[in-house]
């Protein structure tokens, strides 16, 4: 398929509440009207889909209601937020962008963002 450049940060540290945000930017070779953005997680040689959203240019991203991802779009830039992360979710998160319409189809894969998640220390019991 026709290739497209996608840029994303190399490293992001999740907040203590398990939230990680990063920007995914793509170099659109044409005037796409419908774009699909997918977050993939690569662990070892396994690639799994974390979440996906489609948006019409000029409109907002819409993830499924039960998705752990939210996001906003601005031109060729997508701001992605992944919630509910725990230490075991530390890994490489790849931004994939597909220009669905109009033809031809373009696909771009970022190099991935290494997201580090540190579980918060449990609060010690305190007497009041």
């Amino acid at each position: 398929c026709k290739a497209m450049h996608v840029a994303q940060p190399a490293v992001v540290l999740a907040s203590s509440r398990g939230i990680a945000s990063f920007v995914c930017e793509y170099a659109s070779p044409g005037k796409a009207t419908e774009v699909r953005v997918t977050v993939l997680r690569q662990a070892d040689s396994q690639v799994t889909e974390v979440c996906a959203a489609t948006y019409m240019m000029g409109n907002e991203l819409t993830f499924l209601d039960d998705s752990i991802c939210t996001g906003t779009s601005s031109g060729n830039q997508v701001n992605l937020t992944i919630q509910g992360l725990r230490a075991m979710d530390t890994g490489l998160y790849i931004c994939k962008v597909e220009l669905m319409y109009p033809p031809p189809y373009y696909l771009g894969i970022g190099n991935g963002t290494q997201i580090y998640v540190i579980d918060p220390e449990p609060c010690p019991d305190s007497d009041f």
Epitope: C1, K2, T48, E49, K96, M100, Y101, I109
Partner: antibody
Framework: QVQLVESGGGVVQPGRSLRLSCAAS????????MHWVRQAPGKGLEWVAL????????YYADSVKGRFTISRDNSKNTLYLQMNSLRAEDTAVYYC????????????????WGQGTLVTVSS | EIVLTQSPATLSLSPGERATLSCRAS??????LAWYQQKPGQAPRLLIY???NRATGIPARFSGSGSGTDFTLTISSLEPEDFAVYYC??????????FGQGTKLEIK
């Protein structure tokens, strides 16, 4: 083993409609994009239409756009091609073919094919 | 639309000989090219994908090479069952997916 079985072909008059079906088994149908490819008698292969693995996107060859509609029912492992306003030049063997959707490289090649069903458009 | 041109249209060879089939694209398709074999009355079968990778169950005598606009399918030593029509197909710039017009490999 993988099986794709087309049905619904036959002889039809120009301007009329026909619906083809393709029953799939032996693989995870919902992970595969599905195509229709046709072959006119004694001619080469011509791609007709593609539907995304989850049915969300559809693409057509210019020669059938606006006349043919591709659809799928993942609960029934079945692919369809609704053909309207048929023309003599639509006469061909119609094959359904699967194409795995790779997460990193997108839709793949036509890895499994049915045996084909013949559609003849003639008055 | 990318046009794929195959040559020769017909290739007459004997079993045991080496067959070289060519496919040329009207613009670069990188390595996103496949080869299919079709025997009379049968559906096509995927032989080679991404220019040089053999599909599952395809004998080692089949090999593919090339990138950009020029591709080659080689059958190192022809077996009787290899005589068929061969098509190349690209997935670089779609829709539409396009096929070459085919090369008929016949027994000399």
């Amino acid at each position: 083993q993988v099986q794709l079985v087309e049905s619904g072909g036959g002889v039809v008059q120009p301007g009329r409609s026909l619906r083809l079906s393709c029953a799939a088994s032996g693989f995870t149908f919902s992970s595969y994009g599905m195509h229709w490819v046709r072959q006119a008698p004694g001619k080469g292969l011509e791609w007709v239409a593609l539907i995304w693995y989850d049915g969300s996107y559809k693409y057509y060859a210019d020669s059938v756009k606006g006349r043919f509609t591709i659809s799928r029912d993942n609960s029934k492992n079945t692919l369809y091609l609704q053909m309207n306003s048929l023309r003599a030049e639509d006469t061909a063997v119609y094959y359904c073919a699967s194409a795995y959707y790779d997460l990193l490289t997108g839709p793949y090649y036509f890895d499994y094919w049915g045996q084909g069903t013949l559609v003849t458009v003639s008055s | 639309e990318i046009v794929l041109t195959q040559s020769p249209a017909t290739l007459s060879l004997s079993p045991g000989e080496r067959a070289t089939l060519s496919c040329r694209a009207s613009q670069s398709v990188s390595s996103y090219l496949a080869w299919y074999q079709q025997k009379p009355g049968q559906a096509p079968r995927l032989l080679i994908y991404d220019a040089s990778n053999r599909a599952t169950g395809i004998p080692a005598r089949f090999s593919g090479s090339g990138s950009g606009t020029d591709f080659t399918l080689t059958i190192s030593s022809l077996e009787p069952e290899d005589f068929a029509v061969y098509y190349c197909q690209q997935r670089s710039n779609w829709p539409p997916y396009t096929f070459g017009q085919g090369t008929k490999l016949e027994i000399k």
